[in-house]
């Protein structure tokens, strides 16, 4: 006879899982806010900057009430994957000017990656349907100039900040419904 069966595996409390996701998201939000401020100090932005390849903001604050957990987590994961890809691109192709944002940009990338893994874990713990594998994204074109890289950095960090701010609010609201 094989070894006696172990105790039944208790699924962790989903609220505790969500809590740790909120903490990671809030921490990344503060890091992003600070890094965006650092970028503005080094390379002041002349107005708002956009990048067509970035995801559009998932939700206005007013529409938070209608959110459902599977939709929020799936959308958040997809958006953060896009931002991770953009941060990686920025570090690789952003030019020598943006080297002054290291090691902070590298830390941001690592924390973004960690948050994505946490979201994946949360989705499996909540037995949510796993999204299909991401189709290969077209490669991002290198910035046309050093200033193009700086403008892209403003757009990426600004968009990530808005996305994470939305995510914290959304996750906290969803926690009350679990």
């Amino acid at each position: 006879p094989g070894p006696p069966p172990g105790p039944p595996r208790v699924s962790p409390d989903p609220r505790a899982e969500l809590d740790s996701t909120v903490l990671l998201t809030r921490s990344l939000l503060a890091d992003t806010r600070q890094l965006a401020a650092q970028l503005r100090d080094k390379f002041p932005a002349d107005g708002d900057h956009n990048l067509d390849s970035l995801p559009t903001l998932a939700m206005s604050a007013g529409a938070l009430g209608a959110l459902q957990l599977p939709g929020v987590l799936t959308r958040l994961r997809a958006d953060l994957l896009s931002y991770l890809r953009h941060v990686q691109w920025l570090r690789r192709a952003g030019g020598s000017s943006l080297k002054t944002l290291e090691p902070e940009l590298g830390t941001l990338q690592a924390r973004l990656d960690r948050l994505l893994r946490r979201l994946q874990l949360l989705m499996s713990r909540l037995a949510l349907p796993q999204p299909p594998p991401d189709p290969p994204a077209p490669p991002l074109a290198p910035p046309s100039s050093a200033w193009g890289g700086i403008r892209a950095a403003h757009a990426i960090l600004g968009g990530l900040h808005l996305t994470l701010d939305w995510a914290v609010r959304g996750l906290l609201l969803l926690k009350t419904r679990l």
């Epitope: 809590d19 909120v22 903490l23 990671l24 809030r26 921490s27 939000l29 503060a30 806010r33 600070q34 965006a36 401020a37 650092q38 503005r40 100090d41 080094k42 002041p44 906290l172």
Partner: antibody, heavy 120, light 108 residues
């Protein structure tokens, strides 16, 4: 040794203006974010405003937004708080404070404070 | 905004006793953004503990901090006469940065 010395406080009438200064020494002023924090008589601490080293990002408490302006002159190692449309509830000791080594390590160094009294 | 609530409002203890001060946060915050300050009458506040549990420069080892999520604690293992003061917690994760209302530690 890090030193922060505030000045410019005093008695002002409601609706009036005042400009506070904070002279910094003992550290590379241009490398640190700076804050103003206030304390009404017998009350607790209230954060007022923050400015990044290069002055390109500024945050304010809702209670002072639109009335107070934080600024700095790195060449003069000085931090300022321009206070307009003053109200009785702005009466407080105003402290300038420097972040520790990183933005997320709290307010490590404080001045001795300057008292602002708003009264008719 | 994130609201910090400190308890008790006043704590009356004798020198040599252990003091436990609490700070409850309205929202979950990462522990690296929670700090503690000490203020004596007529003086500016002084940073005691940063990032929940790190002692600031020159702070004696009888002070310690702990906690996570929404509940944080400042502990003074054995009170010295100079420890009687007002203590504030503060969060730095979200703008506006906010302080607790303070706990007054007084001699019994």
């Amino acid at each position: 040794e890090v030193q922060l010395v505030e000045s410019g406080g005093g008695l002002v009438q409601p609706g009036g203006s005042l400009r506070l200064s904070c002279a910094a020494s003992g550290f590379t002023f241009s490398s640190y974010g700076m804050h103003w924090v206030r304390q009404a008589p017998g009350k607790g601490l209230e954060w007022v405003a923050y400015i990044t080293p290069g002055s390109n990002t500024i945050y304010y408490a809702d209670t002072v937004k639109g009335r107070f302006t934080i600024s700095r002159d790195n060449a003069k190692n000085s931090l300022y708080l321009q206070m307009n449309s003053l109200r009785a509830e702005d009466t407080a000791v105003y402290y300038c404070a420097r972040e520790y080594y990183s933005y997320d390590e709290g307010f490590a160094y404080w001045g001795q404070g300057t008292l602002v009294t708003v009264s008719s | 905004e994130i609201v910090l609530t400190q308890s008790p409002a006043t704590l009356s203890l004798s020198p040599g006793e252990r003091a436990t001060l609490s700070c409850s946060v309205s929202d979950l915050i990462p522990s690296q953004y929670l700090h503690w300050y000490q203020q004596k009458p007529g003086q500016a506040p002084r940073l005691l503990i940063y990032r929940t549990s790190n002692l600031a420069s020159g702070i004696p080892a009888r002070f310690s901090g702990s906690g996570s999520g929404t509940d944080f604690t400042l502990t003074i293992s054995s009170l010295e006469p100079e420890d009687f003061a007002v203590y504030y917690c503060q969060q730095g994760v979200d703008v506006p940065f906010t302080f607790g209302q303070g706990t007054k530690l007084e001699i019994k």
